[in-house]
């Protein structure tokens, strides 16, 4: 969490941003809140990006003002106009690109004063893994697949029964470039699987960590997966 203040005492307002990550090809949110004002027409929101000449987005006098918008953001940004009055200056970013990564500044002016805060925005690709029993294999084998990752992640297998065991000798992981030539499909195969055990396939890069669990018993198979972004901290 980054909290920024305007300069000069009583003419400063608190602006808060949260570092976040964008999944390339999807929409992203750059989070920013501020002390609200009672009049929408008195609020100015400016989003800037370090190293970019034009503005990312500007909202003032109750409407978007995009005549100074940088080319890389044209047609790709929006504020939540109906929430500005309650202090939400968050920015929606369409079709996140790798090049959108960087340091952003949320700059606010209201009748109470000015304030700003920086936000670190990481971009990459991350997706939920799915673990299945591979019935085509000669021995009991598990297959963990996740469709989109970037940068290349690490894959680690773990098991409930053999806690602390190293499965690198009995697993094989491959990375297949997707059609857009950036993200990759992750496939990891675990051999010599025993029944009545829960196995976890953990995929991690510097942006996200995802786990796919599978519980294999004689009577049923149970699956569960979850994904966690690693760098959500506020300023």
């Amino acid at each position: 969490l980054i909290i920024g203040f305007g300069i000069s005492g009583r003419h400063s307002i608190t602006v808060t941003t949260v570092a976040s990550a964008g999944n390339i090809g999807e929409d992203g949110i750059l989070s920013c809140t501020f002390e609200p004002d009672i009049k929408l027409s008195d609020i100015v929101i400016q989003w800037l990006k370090e190293g970019v000449l034009g503005l990312v987005h500007e909202f003032k006098e109750g409407k978007d003002e995009l005549s100074e918008q940088d080319e890389m953001f044209r047609g790709r940004t929006a504020v939540f106009a109906d929430q500005v009055i309650v202090g939400n200056a968050s920015l929606r970013l369409k079709n996140v690109q790798l090049t959108d990564a960087g340091t952003y500044k949320c700059y606010i002016i209201t009748s109470k004063g000015k304030g700003n805060a920086n936000l670190e925005y990481k971009t990459g690709a991350f997706s939920m893994p799915e673990v299945n029993v591979d019935y085509n294999a000669s021995s009991e084998t598990l297959r963990c697949e996740a469709p989109r990752w970037f940068p290349q992640p690490t894959v680690v297998w773990a098991s409930q029964v053999d806690q602390g065991a190293n499965f690198s000798e009995v697993s094989n992981t491959s990375f297949e470039l997707n059609s857009e030539n950036v993200t990759m499909k992750v496939v990891s195969v675990l051999y010599n699987v025993t029944i009545n055990n829960t196995y976890s396939c953990m995929i991690e890069n510097d942006i996200a960590k995802a786990t796919g669990d599978i519980k294999v018993t004689e009577s049923e198979i149970k699956r569960r997966s979850h994904l966690q972004l690693l760098n959500s901290k506020a300023s």
């Epitope: 003002e65 995009l66 044209r74 047609g75 940004t77 929006a78 929606r92 369409k94």
Partner: antibody
Framework: QVQLVESGGGVVQPGRSLRLSCAVS????????VQWVRQAPGKGLEWLGV???????DYNAAFLSRLTISKDNSKNTVYFQMNSLRAEDTAVYYC?????????????WGQGTLVTVSS | DIQMTQSPSSLSASVGDRVTITCKAS??????VSWYQQKPGKAPKLLIY???NRYTGVPSRFSGSGSGTDFTLTISSLQPEDFATYYC?????????FGQGTKLEIK
């Protein structure tokens, strides 16, 4: 209320150029992009290009070499110029305004202006 | 370019019927799909934007759904004024593209 009015259509000879105007009112140029879409007789819609608030443009690659979109902020008017016209460019040409700054659809359309390419 | 394939290309229905038109994108387009109604000699009218948001003034019988590659426009109870041609369009990536249209006729 928001209005877009196209003008400049008519009969154009093959190989010649076409210049259309789109006069807008009821919204500011500085907030929204203006799109150009055409529709050949009895056919579907085809996107041609857009001019953004900043004046920068994006074009359908199929028309890149012969299309120019510009605007005059003082006149609240967008201009569309297409060169080297051929018979298959015969269509109704529309200008339209985005529904949101993030372009989730085209909310307001002009009435359209018919361009016929014929000798 | 992203292809938007609409189906059916035409359909006959009666007043009061529930009608569904589908649109399939050749690649993922998130929720950047809009639906338009067009009557002969008139400009298209926006019905749905962002896949599921009904545009201002559009009757509640029109609804949109879907994300990724599969999208649907539903008219819950056809009214006489709904007989027209309907188009889907994507504004996710350039060039923006439209479906070939669905002509809705009176049975």
């Amino acid at each position: 209320q928001v209005q877009l009015v196209e003008s400049g259509g008519g009969v154009v000879q093959p190989g010649r150029s076409l210049r259309l105007s789109c006069a807008v009112s009821g919204f500011t140029f500085s907030s929204y992009g203006v799109q150009w879409v055409r529709q050949a007789p009895g056919k579907g819609l085809e996107w041609l290009g857009v001019i953004w608030s900043s004046g920068s443009t994006d074009y359908n690659a199929a028309f890149l070499s012969r299309l120019t979109i510009s605007k005059d902020n003082s006149k609240n008017t967008v201009y569309f110029q297409m060169n080297s016209l051929r018979a298959e460019d015969t269509a109704v040409y529309y200008c339209a305004r985005d529904v949101t700054t993030i372009v989730e659809g085209f909310a307001h359309w002009g009435q359209g202006t018919l361009v016929t390419v014929s000798s | 370019d992203i292809q938007m394939t609409q189906s059916p290309s035409s359909l006959s229905a009666s007043v009061g019927d529930r009608v569904t038109i589908t649109c399939k994108a050749s690649e993922k387009v998130g929720t950047y799909v809009s639906w338009y109604q067009q009557k002969p000699g008139k400009a298209p009218k926006l019905l749905i934007y962002g896949a599921s948001n009904r545009y201002t003034g559009v009757p509640s019988r029109f609804s949109g759904s879907g994300s990724g590659t599969d999208f649907t426009l539903t008219i819950s109870s056809l009214q006489p004024e709904d007989f027209a041609t309907y188009y889907c369009g994507q504004t996710y990536s350039y060039p923006f593209t439209f479906g070939q249209g669905t002509k809705l006729e009176i049975k």
